[in-house]
């Protein structure tokens, strides 16, 4: 397997070990630190169907899938209240915040044409709010919303017609917007698209079992990606002047006995077959895996030399996605019989490793609470300390090169496969009320105090 | 537990064909190729290829293209291997073999099946 | 096609004696290296993949290890039902090829 990440386990001396006076780290964040907040269109917006939008692949799930969810039009109403939103962040003080595009609320059928005009004003104002706030947008283009016509038309993911179609939509955001973002993000999470949407049959469009669907999606989604920052690069960045990525997310893995070569190797495996899939091919040298190769030859798609150069080097930082999404259900093969753990910081190190110590945005991070926690999410506060801790510790021991933070997220909403069930916002929001007033829980101010005072102090 | 059951051995004569029989039970059988292996009297082990049962792809040896179609019925759970233009030389056990992803190997095997060539 | 030799051939010895096979490829397979168990009448057994990795259930007299062309295959105490042929098998390439066979019986 490529790189150097399977020092992380051997406990290479160069890796400072976290040894009992660094459980806790009381320092700050390096000077202009990138604090930020995200949200995800299909989880926040809701009016699934006004104002001219199309259905998204979820819209259709959801009524198909999760029987007991009657839409997103419930929510947290983003669509409408924007306001609201607005506030919230002007509470905590971010830096920037993270959001995504809905394909077809721009768009309805997918189809770069006439842009629908109530969609694209709404961008366009959050756009010019949060510039006036002095709020950086991060824009994700695709936070798994495929247009429905897209999915019936070509089979969506599993069709490349699908690649050029995205890099359509792409242009016409970067044209209409670029001008206020500097930082875009293609795809979030391609891994949970491609394993949960086509394999474990979880996320929409709920197809299972065909592993050959599986690879040919993540495939076809890293194929969009690179053309996407090609795209951007030769046409955009010149007076656009941004950058461009992809987030990638991962769990982490520990080996059951930590001596054993062969404990160790399987961990290698289990992260490699999660984010080394995608992050070799645009990180690393523009191909899959060898493992991957040598073990999948019968439905991991190729690439091509030409191919291979095309993909290398597609990011212009390492956006990492690591919380609940990717470890529940962690599937049993990347699992490969080790033990999963929530440790943040050798997560950084096997990045730092694996794929020669790039700048790392931290584009998700948090964790969960039940439904019926209101604003008293100690839990989250307890999680939070310690993600944040870890990687201050990364940055400031291990010399990770992490410049921001995206806590997940601003606001609870739709979470999924887990629909309402959880709840994942910093600010609260009744979804049966008419007015969803986004009211701050504990983990909001303490979120709060960490950007002001830039890290922890005694 | 996993189990693969192959049809009864086969008397052939040359030119003809043979159709082997490889029943799965106790997994998902669309979750896995199926691989088919042959080992001639006194010979080692020769592999002719694979069949995914989702999709029914197929890829097959060298040695073997165009002589062997390897087929699934997925309402019986059930992967076939058809070898045309028989000679003596097929003569063999042939095994139907479920392969793991995560190993790269086969983790189950069939118990077998007979196929004699002869005029 | 990757070529695999297999040596001895075939070999004998007494119950509890330490048993040790090697396997060599035409080419470097890195660590794309699995072992077989095969009896008579039997379905063939996984028992070794990625050349030190056991199968679950295998006794832990059976360990594999090499890198690259290299590869051994040992049985640490033979046991009377450990009669039978073992096949190496490479995965680096396709055609997927195993290598002829070491037939192991007891003295």
């Known amino acids: 397997f490529s790189g150097d990440g399977r020092a992380i386990w051997s406990k290479n001396p160069n890796f400072t070990p976290v040894n009992e006076s660094q459980l806790f780290l009381y320092d700050t964040f390096p000077k202009n630190f990138f604090w930020g907040i995200g949200t995800g269109a299909l989880q926040v917006e809701g009016s699934w169907k006004k104002d001219g939008k199309g259905p998204s692949i979820w819209d259709h799930f959801i009524h198909t899938h999760l029987k007991n969810v009657s839409s997103t039009n419930g929510s947290s109403d983003s669509y409408i209240f924007l306001e609201k939103d607005l506030s919230a962040l002007d509470f905590i003080g971010v830096s920037f915040y993270q959001f995504s595009i809905s394909w077809p609320r721009l768009f309805p059928d997918g189809i770069v044409t006439v842009a629908n005009a109530k969609g694209l004003q709404y961008y366009s104002t959050l756009l010019d709010a949060l510039v006036l706030r002095n709020i950086e947008p991060i824009v994700t283009l695709y936070h798994w919303d495929l247009p429905l016509a897209l999915q019936e038309k070509y089979g969506g993911w599993k069709n490349d017609t699908i690649i050029d179609i995205f890099n359509d939509y792409a242009t016409y955001c970067f044209q209409m917007f670029g001008d206020r973002v500097k930082y875009w993000i293609t795809i979030h999470n391609p891994y949970l698209v491609a394993w949960h949407g086509y394999g474990t049959g979880m996320h929409a469009p709920g197809e299972k079992g065909n592993l050959a669907a599986v690879y040919t999606v993540g495939h076809n989604l890293i194929k969009a990606h690179s053309k996407v920052w090609h795209n951007y690069n030769t046409h955009f960045r010149p007076h656009q002047k941004g950058w461009l990525s992809i987030t990638l997310g991962s769990h982490w893995i520990e080996p059951n006995r930590s001596e054993n070569t062969m404990d160790i190797f399987k961990c290698q495996q289990s992260m490699v077959s999660v984010l080394g899939w995608f992050a070799n091919p645009i990180h690393g040298d523009g191909d899959y895996p060898e493992g991957m190769r040598k073990k999948l030859f019968s439905v991991l798609p190729i690439f091509s030399e030409a191919e291979k150069h095309e993909m290398r080097g597609t990011a212009d930082f390492f956006a990492f996605s690591f919380g609940p999404n990717n470890f529940k259900p962690l599937n049993t093969m990347a699992k490969m019989g080790q033990n999963v753990s929530l440790n943040l910081r050798e997560a950084l190190n096997w990045i730092k490793l694996e794929y020669n110590n790039p700048r790392i945005l931290i584009a998700e991070n948090g964790w969960f609470t039940d439904s019926r926690v209101k604003t008293e999410d100690t839990t989250a506060i307890y999680m939070m300390k310690n993600f944040l801790s870890q990687v201050l510790q990364a940055i400031r021991l291990d010399e990770i090169r992490v410049f921001g933070y995206t806590a997940w997220s601003l606001l609870d909403g739709f979470e999924w496969q887990d629909a309402y069930t959880i709840r994942r916002g910093l600010f609260y929001v009744d979804f049966n009320s008419k007015q969803k007033e986004r009211k701050p829980k504990s983990s909001a101010h303490y979120y709060k105090q960490i950007i002001r005072e830039n890290g922890f102090s005694l | 537990q996993v189990q693969l059951v192959q049809s009864g051995a086969e008397v052939k004569k040359p030119g003809a064909s043979v159709k082997v029989s490889c029943k799965a039970s106790g997994y998902t059988f669309t979750s896995y190729d199926i691989n088919w292996v042959r080992q001639a009297t006194g010979q080692g082990l020769e592999w002719m290829g694979w069949m995914n049962p989702h999709s029914g792809n197929t890829g097959y040896a060298q040695k073997f293209q165009g002589r062997v179609t390897m087929t699934r019925n997925t309402s019986i759970n059930t992967a076939y291997m058809e070898l045309s233009s028989l000679r003596s030389e097929d003569t063999a056990v042939y095994y139907c073999?479920?392969?793991?992803?995560?190993?790269?190997?086969?983790?189950?095997w069939g118990q077998g099946t007979m196929v004699t060539v002869s005029s | 096609d990757i070529q695999m030799a297999q040596s001895p051939s075939s070999l004998s010895a007494s119950v509890g004696d330490r048993v040790t096979i090697t396997c060599q490829a035409s080419?470097?397979?890195?660590?794309?290296l699995n072992w077989y168990q095969l009896k008579p009448g039997k379905a063939p057994k996984l028992l070794i993949y990625d050349v030190s990795n056991l199968e679950t259930g295998v006794p832990s007299r059976f360990s594999g290890g090499g890198s690259g062309t290299d590869f051994t295959f040992t049985i640490s105490s033979l046991q009377p039902e450990d009669i039978a042929t073992y096949y190496c098998q490479q995965y680096d390439n396709l055609p997927l090829t195993f290598g002829p066979g070491t037939k192991v019986d007891i003295k």
């Open positions: 080419q470097d397979i890195s660590i794309y």
């Open positions: 073999a479920k392969y793991n992803w995560n190993y790269g190997a086969f983790d189950f």
